[in-house]
Interface confidence: low
């Protein structure tokens, strides 16, 4: 009586079970009554990670330096290869198949978090108190300069974007 | 190595639209960016814009903008560049190219606008 | 997007070095590390001969070398052959998915 289902790592073909190929290799030749499923590892640049019955392996991902990428893991025979930024670039996803230049902090605003390879940089408009008179991927919101404790005093208030400018005192003659 | 073959010379009237074609084959077609660059008599290179085939994604300079169309077709490992509203001046060598750092040059399309 | 400035022209004895320069802006030449350069002989296509500042493609001699400081990429050609004759474009990243190349300079080998 022919099977209906199979044992783990095995397929279903032509009322037979055959065993799948293992990792690394794809299939060339299913099973027969006489023979045993036929299979070939993959080529340089490929890979297959799973037992399976595929006729081609798949290419390992290229981290194309065009878009910004570099390689973080060489693929092998089993694995694909893992794509990471270059400095400065991040992940437009999760899979990381192009980057983006990190995003500078406009004047008035300073970076809250500091771009990775997988985030962006985050910014935070300066509160009251603070600026930043730049455009950075770096920089954080700088305070205002005390005038008082330098014994000055502020001849122009500060703004998001401009520190205090702080002038002598007065004297009473 | 990745190849780009592009479409023959052209000659358009003013005010007529050109479509240029560029074949890549040799690596995976969907792995890498492809800019357009144009480069008029005697003139500099002109950075034109971009597509990235995997998403078909564009990025066109200002100057281009709603003048210029990047599209692909996957099938035929295949992008173009349309440019409409043809002039005079638009008269120059067109090239596509691989990704931004354009390692990789098409034998570049002339495309002539003359009345 | 204005074009990196470049000067018209150069030239260099065989043998001798020639540096050549190309000034941007704090936003693309003196931003990103992206700078490019190309050479182009009459009637062919460019061909990239330095790329991300300094980094030569395989199969570029090491008489090609590049730098950067600041808002102003240099591409210098030493021990220059009669074959560097050609010109010679920078090009560099500019933001929002934008480049920008430079108006080009014409490198004559005299003699």
């Known amino acids: 009586e022919p099977p209906t289902a199979c044992r783990e790592k095995q397929y279903l073909i032509n009322s037979q079970c055959c065993s799948l190929c293992q990792p690394g290799q794809k299939l060339v030749s299913d099973c027969t009554e006489f023979t045993e499923t036929e299979c070939l590892p993959c080529g340089e640049s490929e890979f297959l990670d799973t037992w399976n019955r595929e006729t081609h392996c798949h290419q390992h991902k290229y981290c194309d330096p065009n878009l910004g990428l570099r390689v973080q893991q060489k693929g092998t025979s089993e694995t694909d290869t893992i794509c990471t930024c270059e400095e400065g670039w991040h992940c437009t996803s999760e899979a990381c198949e192009s980057c983006v230049l990190h995003r500078s902090c406009s004047p008035g605003f300073g970076v809250k978090q500091i771009a990775t390879g997988v985030s962006d940089t985050i910014c935070e408009p300066c509160p009251v108190g603070f600026f930043s008179n730049v455009s950075s991927a770096f920089e954080k919101c700088h305070p205002w300069t005390s005038c008082e404790t330098k014994d000055l005093v502020v001849q122009q208030a500060g703004t998001n974007k401009t520190d205090v400018v702080c002038g002598p005192q007065d004297r009473l003659r | 190595q990745v190849q780009l073959v592009q479409s023959g010379a052209e000659v358009k009237k003013p005010g007529s639209s050109v479509k240029v074609s560029c074949k890549a084959s040799g690596g995976t077609f969907s792995s890498y960016a492809i800019s357009w660059v144009r480069q008029a008599p005697g003139q500099g290179l002109e950075w034109m814009g971009m597509i990235n085939p995997s998403g078909g994604t564009t990025s066109y300079a200002q100057k281009f903008q709603g003048r210029v169309t990047m599209t692909r077709d996957t099938s035929t490992s295949t992008v173009y560049m349309e440019l409409s509203s043809l002039r005079p001046e638009d008269t120059a060598v067109y090239y596509c190219a691989r990704g931004f750092r354009m390692d990789q040059w098409g034998q570049g399309t002339l495309v002539t606008v003359s009345s | 997007q204005s074009a990196l400035t470049q000067p018209p022209s150069a030239s260099g004895s065989p043998g001798q070095s020639v540096t050549i320069s190309c000034t941007g802006t704090?936003?693309?030449?003196?931003?990103?590390?992206?700078v490019s350069w190309y050479q182009q002989h009459p009637g062919n296509a460019p061909k990239l001969i330095i790329y991300d500042v300094r980094k030569r493609p395989s199969g570029i001699p090491d008489r090609f070398s590049a730098s950067k400081s600041g808002n102003t990429a240099s591409l210098t050609v030493s021990g220059l052959q009669a074959d560097d004759e050609a010109d010679y474009y920078c090009s560099s990243y500019a933001g929002n998915n934008e480049m920008v190349f430079g108006g080009g300079t014409k490198l004559t080998v005299l003699g």
């Open positions: 704090s936003s693309d030449v003196g931003a990103y590390n992206f």
